[in-house]
């Protein structure tokens, strides 16, 4: 399966939207920085069959969608930007799902690496726990926004490697 060029453009647009979402100066939030333990190894893309890599990317985007779909999120971010953000994430989920369907039967390996999916879910659980502990403060959301932007940048690298594998 070829991930369409539109997918890569959507990823870039997602990052641009997230960059615009800031409501307060991040300079005031340094002390709120937190180690979420981003699962870098899950995005290195070396140990994966293509279908498994796609399923990990899908999980990350789905979890991001869930994170920013909460009422606490809606109360924090600009509604227009959030709507654009959802649209881009939805586009990426659709692209990845279409790709996953095409991979059915192409590879002998399972379509999903369950351990990797669980690792990504636990990563997002840590983010959610941090937001809860910080009572969804503006700085906590800024830290999370920065973390998600970083994880999207790193996942874009995996997508690029997948495209080069074609």
């Amino acid at each position: 399966c070829d991930l369409p060029q539109t997918h890569s453009l959507s990823n870039r647009r997602t990052l641009m939207i997230m960059a615009q979402m800031g409501r307060i100066s991040p300079f005031s939030c340094l002390k709120d920085r937190h180690d979420f333990g981003f699962p870098q190894e899950e995005f290195d893309g070396n140990q994966f069959q293509k279908a498994q890599a796609i399923s990990v990317l899908h999980e990350m985007i789905q979890q991001t969608f869930n994170l920013f779909s909460t009422k606490d999120s809606s109360a924090t971010w600009d509604e227009t930007l959030l709507d654009k953000f959802y649209t881009e994430l939805y586009q990426q989920l659709n692209d990845l799902e279409a790709c996953m369907m095409q991979e059915v039967g192409v590879e002998d390996t399972p379509l999903m690496n369950v351990d990797s999916i669980l690792t990504v879910r636990k990563y997002f659980q840590r983010i959610t726990l941090y937001l809860t502990e910080k009572k969804y403060s503006p700085c906590a959301w800024e830290v999370v926004r920065a973390e998600i932007m970083r994880s999207f940048s790193l996942s874009a690298n995996l997508q690029e490697r997948l495209r080069r594998k074609e």
Partner: antibody, heavy 121, light 107 residues
């Protein structure tokens, strides 16, 4: 390879203006902040201010607020430090360094080579 | 502003010595403390970040400890290339502030 390359040494007269630069390469320039640090001859390090190149948001040390201006041009991955009217006391080595912003990563992990500014009549 | 106070301001030591430099913050900075090494005519180099994390490529003889207000940089066995000036820096709150430096000289 990550690099921060600063503009060359400058010799200026009091009252003159100056703009020095710091060009980033080998990484996503807008994903990191750029900080500026002063070191006067034989003295320690003083943090001057910082910029987020993604939106040019800046913050200054109270000691340098109003004395210098920090800016950035993300299209050419370059940050700037400028003075509108130099004083002899601005004579120092100026360093730029990258900062990970709100991400959990090492602070000021890469530094420019420094720009020596000499202000003398 | 958070004041950072280093001690001693200078020390003389021999190759192979264990060297300890301390840094005290005027208020709690959790573990948002970095250590840098600077040699004459060179830019500072990050050694330790978040109080105790060793920066990539830095020899393991360097270690950092502490949290809150009191921090320590330890060089377990001083090497010839370690003679330099060392700075601590807090990254808890703007303005970021450095200690005044500790010069490690050859005895």
């Amino acid at each position: 390879e990550v690099q921060l390359v600063q503009s060359g040494a400058e010799v200026k007269k009091p009252g003159e203006s100056l703009k020095i630069s710091c060009k980033g390469s080998g990484y996503s320039f807008t994903s990191y902040w750029i900080g500026w640090v002063r070191q006067m001859p034989g003295k320690g390090l003083e943090w001057m201010g910082i910029i987020d190149p993604s939106d040019s948001d800046t913050a200054y040390s109270p000691s340098f607020q109003g004395q210098v201006t920090i800016s950035a041009d993300k299209s050419i991955s370059t940050a700037y430090l400028q003075w509108s009217s130099l004083k002899a006391s601005d004579t120092a080595m100026y360093y730029c360094a990258r900062h990970p912003g709100l991400n959990w990563a090492p602070d000021f992990d890469y530094w420019g080579q420094g720009t020596l500014v000499t202000v003398s009549s | 502003d958070i004041q950072m106070t280093q001690s001693p301001s200078s020390l003389s030591a021999s190759v192979g010595d264990r060297v300890t430099i301390t840094c005290r913050a005027s208020q709690s900075i959790d573990d948002f403390l970095n250590w840098y090494q600077q040699k004459p005519g060179k830019a500072p180099k990050l050694l330790i970040y978040f109080a105790s994390s060793l920066q990539s490529g830095v020899p393991s003889r360097f270690s950092g400890s502490g949290s809150g207000t009191d921090f320590t940089l330890t060089i377990s066995s001083l090497q010839p290339e370690d003679f330099a000036t060392y700075y601590c820096q807090q990254s808890h709150t703007l303005p970021l502030t450095f200690g005044q430096g500790t010069k490690v000289e050859i005895k």
